[in-house]
């Protein structure tokens, strides 16, 4: 007799591991024999799908190699035309050993920033993720946390966070380990010991010391007055991420020396700077040595003051005499911009003729100092107030550099023109000019009169003072 189908063994939940076989059984009693169809998540499973095997007149569904995407609800439906169709459903739970789908990668990070080491996992049951640093399990703290995704987040990365990391994914079916990755913490260059300023005598040796650290270890470069150091020797040593640089200099001129520590972070650089000054205590020393040569002046500052084509003494105590002496007059010249109109031309004449002394060529080129009388004229007549102020400043140490000491002569140490008229140089700018009495102001000063003789008129007098100008 015809009999409507009855499912005698309802489908059950099946647990299966990936790549294993999973079978659902749907035993049906009926007459005539029913047609049995299978669905997964309400989608018909086709008979010719090679991933499945349907046997026993459709009562057995076998998944030949389970994939993680096979989980879902499987239903069998039996129908033989007698009565209604019957259905039974069961779930396939794909069990999966832990698998790391996005492993961590090597990371370089600058100290103080946030680092995230990824570790995305798969597995059923859902794996728990932990991290190992070096050989020990990583303990979470206020800066370190394992995110829901399994990634490791480190806030405010510190040097001590650097090291080797791996993540571990674990569930009831097994454990998976990522490859070991490196977290490198880079640190901006920082100067630990800055060079110290020195005040030394001309021609002495000075060692400037600069120590820096950073990751990677920085390089140190030295700058002299804004340019790469051209002379001197540099010794360097590196120990425990600290670089120590010593610059040894032979001092022939004052300078500003800057230690620059630089390291590279990807395409960017970080730098740290520290500077020291080297000043010269006895600027007048090179002049005493009288080592040098005679040559025409070809600078700029004293061009209008010195006689055209005059031979000047270039002092080879300096590495580059011409430049050193020009720098000297330039520095002092700038200070003369503020002096009175009476003082300025006289002071400029004195300055240029003192730094670029007239030179007597011969077997031994000899500088000819300015005659004392002319020096005193500038000091006590033309620039009395200014000279006094400058000497006060010097005594009170208000000059930042000692450079002006070379550019201002000590009048008392200069030879007098009365001793030997050929042994000292005159300043034509200060000579009384009979044709043009305006070139020398009336001596209304109450100071002792300065012994400037009535010299022959000079065609190169270059400044003129109003006769009504009176010194106060």
């Amino acid at each position: 007799l015809p009999k409507a189908p009855v499912i005698t063994t309802p489908l059950e939940t099946v647990d299966a591991l990936v790549e294993e076989v999973a079978t659902f059984m749907c035993a049906v009693e009926s007459y005539p024999q029913p047609e049995i169809s299978w669905t997964r998540n309400k989608i018909l499973i086709k008979l010719f799908d090679t991933r499945y095997s349907i046997r026993e007149n459709g009562q057995l569904l076998t998944i030949l190699s389970v994939e993680d995407s096979d989980d879902g609800i499987y239903c069998c439906t039996a129908n033989n035309g007698v009565g209604g169709a019957v259905e039974s459903c069961g779930a396939l739970q794909v069990k999966m050993k832990p698998k790391i789908t996005r492993p961590p990668i090597n990371v370089k990070i600058i100290e103080g920033l946030k680092a995230v080491l990824p570790c995305t996992t798969m597995g059923n049951p859902k794996p728990s993720v932990s991290w190992i640093k070096g050989d020990s399990p990583l303990r979470e703290n206020s800066r370190t946390a394992v995110l829901e995704s399994g990634s490791l987040r480190i806030h405010n990365v510190q040097k001590e966070d650097a090291g080797q990391y791996r993540c571990v994914a674990k569930n009831s079916l097994g454990t998976a380990y990522s490859k070991v990755v490196k977290l490198e913490v880079e640190v901006f260059a920082r100067i630990l010991r800055a060079p110290e300023s020195h005040n030394v005598t001309f021609g002495s040796f000075v060692t400037l010391h600069c120590t820096a650290t950073g990751i990677p270890v920085p390089t140190i470069t030295w700058i002299e007055n804004g340019n790469a150091v051209s002379s001197g020797s540099i010794q360097e040593s590196v120990k425990d991420r600290v670089i120590d640089s010593r610059l040894q200099l032979f001092i022939t001129k004052p300078g500003l020396y800057t230690c620059i520590a630089t390291n590279k972070h990807g395409e960017k650089f970080s730098t740290a700077k520290a500077a020291a000054t080297v000043s010269i205590a006895e600027w007048s020393k090179p002049q005493k040595d009288n080592k040098g040569y005679c040559a025409q002046y070809r600078g700029e500052v004293c061009n209008a003051v010195l006689a055209k084509d005059a031979l000047v003494f270039l002092n080879t105590s300096y590495a580059d005499p011409e430049e050193a002496q020009e720098l000297l007059v330039h520095t002092a010249w700038n200070e003369l911009k503020v002096v009175s109109p009476l003082c300025r031309p006289a002071a400029e004449a004195l300055l240029c003729n003192h730094v670029f002394q007239e030179c007597s060529p011969g077997v031994v080129p000899t500088p000819i100092p300015i005659c004392r009388e002319y020096c005193l004229a500038v000091k006590e007549l033309f620039c009395a107030k200014e000279w006094l102020a400058m000497e006060e400043k010097t005594h009170r140490g208000l000059y930042r550099s000692e450079m002006h000491l070379l550019s201002v002569p000590e009048c008392s140490k200069l030879p007098s023109m009365h001793w030997d008229p050929t042994a000292c140089a005159r300043l034509p700018h200060l000579d009384y000019n009979k044709e043009n009495p305006k070139t020398f102001p009336p001596m209304t000063s109450s100071k002792p009169s300065v012994d400037i003789p009535n010299l022959p008129s000079s065609s190169s007098s270059s400044f003129s003072v109003s006769p009504t100008y009176s010194m106060t």
């Epitope: 040569y293 070809r298 600078g299 700029e300 020009e326």
Partner: antibody, heavy 121, light 112 residues
């Protein structure tokens, strides 16, 4: 790294004008004198013009006086050579060169790679 | 205007010594001319070797030295190297003639 890069060269007709520029980097430009030196094809070096660190004076070779003007913009770290009334004998590679110190004259311790100026009709 | 004179060409054996000179068509070269020396290899910009007669620029090998020889300035290469083969120019400051800087015609040095 110290660099001097000349630009502005090219082909110009006799009587025409060109302005050469020299961009300086890697050193304190306003601490140094600068010069222009030229070299005609297959010939020797010829000094053209010089200027000290502050631009306060300018100096020229006799044959270019009144036609060429050297100038500098220390803020822009650039040296210029304005060339007017150009002649065929001005055809040369023009080098910008740095002095070893402040004043206009003396050893030229750094040179650019040069820019070619061709004066031809 | 005075012309700065140099030997058109000179040759030296590797390891040998050679002296290049720099004179004036009228008169002597003195310290007031501040003689400078330059080296130029083909296709390259010139390079300064010596300034103000005898001061060597930094990075210039010690085999290059400057001096006066008679009424001329001189550049001496002691222990010449193959890489010294180049054109050498001297340059003089001419202060009396409205401040000029004049190059010599150059010396082609061959290291055989």
């Amino acid at each position: 790294e110290l660099q001097l890069v000349e630009s502005g060269g090219g082909l110009v007709q006799p009587g025409g004008s060109l302005r050469l520029s020299c961009a300086a980097s890697g050193f304190t430009f306003d601490d140094y004198g600068m010069s222009w030196v030229r070299q005609a094809p297959g010939k020797g070096l010829e000094w053209v013009s010089a200027i000290p660190w502050n631009g306060g004076s300018t100096y020229y070779k006799e044959s270019v006086k009144g036609r060429f003007t050297i100038s500098r913009d220390n803020a822009k770290k650039t040296l210029y050579l304005q060339m007017n009334s150009l002649k065929s004998e001005d055809t040369a590679v023009y080098y910008c060169a740095k002095r070893s110190g402040r004043i206009a004259f003396g050893a030229l311790d750094a040179w650019g790679q040069g820019t070619l100026v061709t004066v031809s009709s | 205007q005075a012309v700065v004179t140099q030997e058109p060409s000179l040759s030296v054996s590797p390891g040998g010594t050679v002296t290049l000179t720099c004179g004036l068509s009228s008169g002597s070269v003195t310290s007031s001319n501040y003689p400078d020396w330059y080296q130029q290899t083909p296709g390259q910009a010139p390079r300064a070797l010596i300034y103000s007669t005898n001061s060597r620029l930094s990075g210039v090998p010690s085999r290059f030295s400057g001096s006066f020889s008679g009424n001329k300035a001189a550049l001496t290469i002691t222990g010449a190297q193959p890489e010294d083969e180049a054109d050498y120019y001297c340059a003089l400051y001419m202060g009396s003639e409205s401040r000029n800087y004049v190059f010599g015609g150059g010396t082609k040095l061959t290291v055989l």
